[in-house]
Amino acid sequence: EPPTACREKQYLINSQCCSLCQPGQKLVSDCTEFTETECLPCGESEFLDTWNRETHCHQHKYCDPNLGLRVQQKGTSETDTICTCEEGWHCTSEACESCVLHRSCSPGFGVKQIATGVSDTICEPCPVGFFSNVSSAFEKCHPWTSCETKDLVVQQAGTNKTDVVCGPQDRLRA
């Protein structure tokens, strides 16, 4: 009685259970009455990452420098190449097929999380007591200067974009 289902790492063909090819190898010939499945290693710059019955290996991803990409991890016969973005850039998608320049946080906003090769800059509004007067992909919100610790007084209040202006305390005339 021919099988209707096969074990793990096998596939059913011509009423026979054949072994799948291991990761890093492609199928040449299905198993037969006389032979095991015939598999061959993937070529240079090719891979297969699962137990399979593929007759062609997949090409490694190309990290195109014209798109701001570079190799983060070189592919093997069992894994694809992993691309990441050049310094100052990040991937536009999880597949990292192209890159865009890291976003800068405008004045009034500070960097909450610095961008990586795969994620953009995360900005946050500067809360009361903090400011940012530059457009930057690195600068956090800075705390207003504490005039008191310098024995000075606030002459001009700070905003989310400007620091306080400190000045000398008015002396009482005799």
Epitope: D30, F34, T35, E36, E38
Partner: antibody, heavy 113, light 112 residues
């Protein structure tokens, strides 16, 4: 449908090289393996060697030093070359696909001066 | 090189009677994948061999169910439940587990 056909000289002199061709139809040699078997008159079967779909070969150790099996996938042909022939190489030579029951009709090769 | 030894060499059988052929291997025919590549062929006079049984016990398509195969490891048997006139010829066991593939010496079945 699947067919295999052996061709070559019927008569070869001792010490010469035998060249046989197996021409196949109905399937691709890049996906299927083919082997050679021979049968001396009135005797049993002897496995000679095989050409795998992927291009590698396996030979019978008793013949390996005299044997070459190759293929031309585009011509759908598998070739057998056996050198330094003696009368003991006289046999019907068959090519066979390694699945199902696909045999050539066989070709008789006689080694004689 | 692996040897396959068949017995008997000659098997005279009465039509309609059962017949049995033994094939012994000099080493186990179980492959690393668990398959046992032991096969049976019938060669009628003037013809190329015809596959009857593959992988010990699987009847090839079109082969009558009076033919059956059994065995494991190194001992294998081909049985014909009721011999018919067309069953005459030489029976060969064959293995494709180990290179070189090999054939048994053959068993000649004839009608008494």
């Amino acid at each position: 449908q699947v067919q295999l056909q052996e061709s070559g000289p019927g008569l070869v002199k001792p010490s010469q090289t035998l060249s046989l061709t197996c021409t196949v139809s109905g399937f691709s040699l890049s996906r299927y393996s083919v082997y050679w078997v021979r049968q001396p008159p009135g005797k049993g079967l002897e496995w000679i060697g095989m050409m795998w779909g992927g291009g590698s070969t396996d030979y019978n150790p008793s013949l390996k030093s005299r044997l070459t099996i190759s293929k031309d996938t585009s011509k759908s042909q598998v070739s057998l070359k056996l050198s330094s022939l003696t009368a003991a190489d006289t046999a019907v030579y068959y090519c066979v696909r390694t699945d199902g029951d696909y045999w050539g009709q066989g070709t008789l090769v006689t080694v004689s001066s | 090189e692996l040897q396959l030894t068949q017995s008997p060499l000659s098997l005279p059988v009465t039509l309609g009677q059962p017949a049995s052929i033994s094939c012994r291997s000099s080493q186990s025919l179980a492959s690393s994948s668990g398959n046992t590549y032991l096969h049976w062929y019938l060669q009628r006079p003037g013809q190329s061999p015809r596959l009857l049984i593959y992988k010990v016990s699987n009847r090839f398509s079109g082969v009558p169910d009076r033919f059956s195969g059994s065995g494991s490891g190194t001992d294998f048997t081909l049985k014909i439940s009721r011999v018919e006139a067309e069953d005459v010829g030489v029976y060969y066991c064959s293995q494709s587990t180990h290179v070189p593939w090999t054939f048994g010496g053959g068993t000649k079945l004839e009608i008494k």
